[in-house]
């Protein structure tokens, strides 16, 4: 906390310019009206305020603001943005895209801080949903942005906001965060045709159902295994040989190197061994010939 | 972190020269802006210069004309050169930079050379 002392004569601050930096903590706290901080808040950033001073600025606007700064304010924070705490940055209301990709510039570069993480999700639950282009900046600052997300807060992404979505965007997420995203993507891609839409949606497969499965298979798609790996397992297993088979095309033969692996070990288990044998690729582990599979499943929901 | 050292002070008769040199270490490339303080015995310690990433700098008005702050973005290195000593330039001079890390600033500093203008 500065005391407060009275500005020395002809020191008292008539703009906020750069000769402001050669003042004492006390003298910037003296000698710079609050309200003319607020006004001339764009020059601020411009201006290498030392560490000590911008404690002095930001009490002033504290001072000033006590229930939150006005966005005409936090749009020109600058460095002042790291000197805010979570508790600082609840109480705003931010609306514009500007703003937040003005503060996100500051912290470039850098792990998300809880700081950021307020921000975004105060600025989230002010547009109501994360619409593309929020999503667009948000990624493109944050790549895992997406996978940090819950579910639930994901079920407020609109399907025309999946189009913002790269591949690296989704590299952290957990199925149950795929599982919400994929049925989005698939409504969003719905337009294109077969080759282009598996670009689009190859990202998202890991929440895809058995049918969707079978059904690209019959759209000549040759999945890669990389993404064969990241299916769900319970979508996988009701799949036939001949459905793997067309599913993968030439990547097939990359089911050896895989076969202690799930999904495809659990695959394995499923399927009887001589139609395993048709691959030619020595996969072993398939139930043998003369064997009957009793779908136990089935059973109980038939009693 | 950011580690500084300076280096350069001394004993100097008034109206002679010094050049202060601060070399940095560390995350280097998050600095933009640095900066030389100084503490005179006594007294609290004040800013005489400073220098930004783009190389734009300004010096305080009583050693304007006398004091000139560069840096050498190659070297890591910040430099104070001081002409025309008087004795009232004599404090030990500090170096200091923040940086952005983890979502909040950090301030870091040199441990001071003493600069003593005497004759």
């Known amino acids: 906390e500065v005391e407060k002392t009275a500005c020395p004569s002809g020191k008292k601050a008539r703009e906020i310019d750069e000769s402001l930096i050669f003042y004492k903590k006390w003298e910037l706290e003296a000698c710079v009206d609050a309200a003319l901080l607020a006004t001339q808040m764009d020059r601020v950033n411009a201006i290498p305020f030392t560490y000590e001073q911008l404690d002095v600025l930001k009490h002033k606007l504290d001072e000033l603001y006590p229930q939150g700064y006005p966005e005409s304010v936090i749009q020109h924070l600058g460095y002042l943005f790291l000197k805010m705490s979570p508790e600082d940055i609840r109480k705003w209301n931010v609306t514009s895209l500007e703003t937040l990709k003005a503060l996100l510039e500051v912290n470039k570069g850098h792990e998300m801080s809880p700081q950021v993480a307020t921000l975004i999700d105060r600025f989230v639950k002010g547009r109501g949903q994360l619409d593309k282009d929020t999503l667009d900046t948000l990624t493109a600052f944050y790549p895992g942005y997406l996978c940090s997300l819950s579910p639930e807060e994901l079920s407020s992404v609109p399907p025309s906001s999946i189009w913002a979505v790269r591949p690296q965007d989704l590299d952290t997420c957990d199925p149950r965060q795929l599982d919400v995203l994929y049925p989005k993507a698939r409504l969003a891609f719905q337009n294109m045709n077969g080759s282009e839409y598996f670009v689009k949606i190859q990202s998202f497969l890991g929440g895809a159902p058995t049918e969707d499965l079978k059904a690209l298979s019959q759209q000549n798609v040759s999945m890669d295994l990389a993404t064969f790996m990241k299916l769900r397992t319970d979508a996988v297993l009701p799949l036939t040989v001949a459905e793997v088979q067309k599913l993968l095309g030439p990547h097939v033969e990359g089911l050896k190197a895989e076969e202690r692996h799930r999904p495809v070990r659990d695959w394995i288990l499923r399927q009887r061994q001589d139609d395993l044998d048709t691959l030619g690729l020595g996969l072993q582990g398939g139930i043998p010939n003369g064997y009957l599979v009793l779908d136990l499943s089935m059973q109980e929901a038939l009693s | 972190e950011v580690q500084l050292v300076e280096s350069g002070g001394g004993l100097v008769q008034p109206g002679g020269s010094l050049r202060l040199s601060c070399a940095a270490s560390?995350?280097?490339?998050?600095?933009?802006?640095m900066y030389w303080y100084r503490q005179a015995p006594g007294k609290e310690r004040e800013l005489v210069a400073f220098?930004?990433?783009?190389?734009?700098?300004n010096v305080r008005d009583s050693v304007k004309g006398r004091f000139t702050i560069s840096r050498d973005n190659s070297k890591n290195t910040l430099y104070l050169q001081m002409n025309s000593l008087r004795a009232e330039d004599t404090a030990v001079y500090y170096c200091?930079?923040?940086?952005?890390?983890?979502?909040?600033?950090?301030?870091?500093w040199g441990q001071g050379t003493l600069v003593t203008v005497s004759s």
């Open positions: 220098i930004s990433s783009g190389g734009s700098t």
């Open positions: 560390g995350s280097t490339s998050s600095i933009n802006t």
């Open positions: 200091n930079t923040y940086i952005p890390y983890g979502g909040t600033l950090h301030d870091f």
